[in-house]
């Protein structure tokens, strides 16, 4: 602790100019004071001035008023500094002396004589308020006031708390009257050395080095560092933790760039046709009658469905068609015949059977022929039997479907997983992509099928910290760290929410 006992002398009265022994001063009492401050004593005794002592120069003769003086000799109030915790009690002895000698240093003069002395014992709290008192004896009167104040940078009721205002990286504060710290705006913590970050800045994922700042830790972004950064190259995906790529609905693949729902995203099928997804970026359009083309974008001629029977020729009209019937046939579709079996109406070896008592007939066609008169060669591809873009081919009495890569089955209706063949060596993970399978290799292997042993393993150097698991082949850096709970960062190097430590103090 550290403080100052201050004594202000105000007026001394010794009208008769007498000494304590009854003698008078000639020509008058040239008066100076000796002050002794010590610990509280119920009965004041001689002995060391434990709290300090001070003497004044000659302040006046006999009776006089003492003016305040801030510097030099004769300073008033008198200062008695101490370097300990103020106990709250004290004993004070004020002696008035006459000197025949030097005005400025009367202490050193021989022949000094006591005029009077007063003793004060009691309690005194630290404070700015002066306590005023007056002491009389038969010959003299002394008016004075006193107080105890703390030295600069000392605070509290006993001046025991040291506090120095500060504005540097070890603290940003001012001192309260009790010596506690009052943080400057924008700062917090026991020593006001912790900045208050931008309001809302994420506690774990953001930090600041000065007030109203929000600096993101690796893997986080946004004004408040509350948005994770997804895996580099993530196209149609999001993250809930950094470096993740969780695919949006309808997307797949490591980087969520494989379209699994082309029909919904692109609506490729026109004219009310039905769209069916068939793997990444694959789809098939099933056309309504009257349309054709890969996307059912082509409108068919009204005659395209061959509505005219018995070899009738079809002619397109604005919203309809017209059948020109061959001799022996009539009706809208030439469906009625004036022929009988006698006219040998069945072609290509068809057998004629009479009906309705010989007034009409029906042809029974040999294999590969059809039509009322067996006049048409059967085209087994007209029903578009091949799914998923397969090509239909007539093969004599039958037809076959030639499937696109990735499909199989009689009608190309089955989707082949490229990964079914387990193309990835050395425990690599297989991903079905549009252009074929892609392998994600375990540590120590690379190549399209993980067939190449890496001499330098990116994980071999142990780039991941705090017990994280290392994977290669997932990122441009050749490795990705999977962090354990409580750690973040591209190498799991940042602890989440660091607890303050409590180092030793003396």
């Amino acid at each position: 602790g550290s403080g100052i006992f201050q004594l202000r002398l105000q007026e001394f009265v010794n009208q008769r100019g007498m000494l304590a022994n009854g003698q008078s001063c000639e020509p008058g009492c040239r008066t100076f004071f000796r002050i002794c401050l010590k610990h509280f004593q119920a009965t004041f005794s001689e002995g060391p001035c434990t709290f300090g002592n001070v003497s004044t120069p000659v302040l006046g003769t006999n009776s006089f008023v003492v003016r305040d003086k801030n510097s030099g000799s004769g300073r008033n109030p008198l200062q008695l500094p101490f370097n300990f915790t103020w106990p709250g009690t004290f004993s004070l002895n004020i002696q008035a002396w006459h000197t025949p000698g030097d005005d400025l240093r009367p202490e050193t003069s021989p022949g000094n004589s006591l005029i009077s002395q007063i003793i004060i014992q009691g309690s005194l709290a630290v404070g700015k308020i002066w306590r005023t008192d007056e002491q009389n004896d038969t010959l003299t009167r002394l008016s004075y006031s006193y107080r105890v104040i703390c030295s600069d940078n000392y605070y509290g009721e006993s001046c025991s708390r040291l506090c120095k205002k500060r504005d540097d990286h070890f603290g940003h504060y001012e001192c309260q009257p009790d010596g506690s710290l009052s943080c400057l705006p924008g700062w917090t913590g026991k020593y006001c050395d912790q900045p208050i970050c931008l309001s809302g800045c994420h506690e774990q994922n953001g930090y600041c080095s000065k007030p109203d700042e929000c600096i993101c830790r690796p893997g986080w972004q946004g004004r408040l560092c509350n948005e994770c950064i997804p895996h580099n190259g993530c196209r149609h995906g999001t993250c809930s933790i950094p470096w993740q790529c969780a695919c949006d609905e309808g997307w797949g693949g490591l980087f969520c760039d494989q379209d699994l729902n082309y029909c919904t995203h692109h609506s490729p099928c026109k004219n009310g046709s039905t769209c069916s997804n068939s793997g990444p970026k694959g789809y098939t359009c099933t056309c309504l009658p009257g349309y054709t083309g890969e996307h059912c974008e082509l409108g068919l001629s009204k005659c395209a469905s061959n509505p005219c029977r018995n070899g009738g020729s079809c002619k397109d009209q604005e919203n309809s068609y017209h059948c020109l019937c061959p001799p022996g046939y009539y009706g809208q579709h030439c469906e009625h015949s004036t022929l009988t079996c006698a006219d040998s109406p069945c072609f290509n070896g068809g057998s004629c059977r009479e009906r309705n008592q010989g007034s009409s007939y029906a042809c029974e066609c040999p294999p590969n022929f059809t039509g009322s008169n067996c006049e048409k060669k059967v085209d087994r591809c007209t029903s578009n039997p091949c799914a998923n873009g397969g090509q239909c081919q007539n093969r004599g009495p039958s037809r076959t479907c030639r499937c696109r890569p990735g499909f199989t089955g009689t009608h190309c209706e089955l989707h082949i997983s490229d990964c079914a063949r387990s193309p990835c060596a050395h425990g690599g993970t297989c991903h079905d992509l549009e252009n074929g399978p892609v392998c994600t290799c375990p540590a120590g292997f690379s190549g399209r099928r993980c067939e190449v042993r890496i001499t330098h393993d990116a994980c071999a150097s142990g780039p991941c910290f705090n017990g994280a698991t290392c994977y290669t082949g997932l990122s441009p850096n050749n490795f990705v760290c999977n962090c354990p709970y409580g750690f973040v960062g591209s190498r799991c190097e940042f602890p989440v929410g660091l607890p303050p430590s409590f180092p030793w103090v003396a």
Epitope: D152, N153, L162, K164, K165, D167, D168, H169, F170, G171, G189, Y191, D193, Q194, Y207, C208, S209, K210, I215, P495, L498, P500, S501, F502, P503, V505
Partner: antibody
């Protein structure tokens, strides 16, 4: 017990960059109670404060060296580093790393043993 | 630029004697002063922080004070093991500043 250990080349050519690393063991460099500083002492002379760093990366440098000094921190390795560019013979000194304690009002309670760096061609 | 000046530069003292080293700087009393002891070929060691406090393990004969423009390190009853160079240190804003050092030698 906290320990600090300086490492780096003992000889650097004039005009090149001096690089030193201080490895902290027995305590976390990420504690909010400490700054991590560099101090140097030319042979037969007194101590000169170079600069310090907080675990978040905030740095403070001696104005007389500021244009040439870079201090960085790697919390994952519990290390902090000093780079001093364009060195001359006047930069020959024992370089110390130290822990500056907020609770001790900036007093440095732990020091490395120091490493002598000589600048000479 | 803030400057700390120590006096004396050198002091030769007999054992059991009292040693006083002064560190002066403009309004130094408004800053916290630390004192370091450095023996030959050793790192500095903190002996006083926050003007007058001793870290654990530092003998009670070491004491410090700081007011006005002067901080003082006092070694009461010097012992042979106290022979060293002593440095005062304070912070001026965000910059650490050391005094030039005082070498204490045993007579």
């Amino acid at each position: 017990e906290v320990q600090l250990q300086e490492s780096g080349p003992g000889l650097v050519k004039p005009s090149e960059t001096l690089s030193l690393t201080c490895t902290v063991s027995g305590g976390s460099i990420s504690s909010s109670s400490y700054y991590w500083g560099w101090i140097r002492q030319p042979p037969g002379k007194g101590l000169e404060w170079i600069g310090d760093i907080y675990y978040t990366g905030s740095t403070y440098y001696n104005p007389s060296l500021k244009s040439r000094v870079t201090i960085s921190v790697d919390t994952s390795k519990n290390q902090f580093s000093l780079k001093l560019s364009s060195v001359t013979a006047a930069d020959t000194a024992v370089y110390y790393c130290a822990r500056e304690d907020v609770i001790l009002r900036g007093g440095s309670d732990y020091w490395g043993q120091g490493t002598l760096v000589t600048v000479s061609s | 630029e803030y400057v700390l000046t120590q006096s004396p530069d050198f002091q030769s003292v007999t054992p059991k004697e009292k040693v006083t080293i002064t560190c002066s700087g403009q309004r130094l009393g408004d800053k916290y002063a630390s004192w370091y002891q450095q023996k030959p070929d050793q790192s500095p060691k903190l002996v006083i922080y926050e003007d007058s406090k001793r870290p654990s393990g530092v003998p009670s004969r070491f004491s410090g004070s700081n007011s006005g423009d002067d901080a003082t390190l006092t070694i009461n009853s010097l012992e042979a093991e106290d022979a060293a160079t002593y440095y005062c240190q304070a912070w001026d804003r965000d910059t650490g500043v050391f005094g030039q050092g005082t070498k204490v030698e045993i007579k």
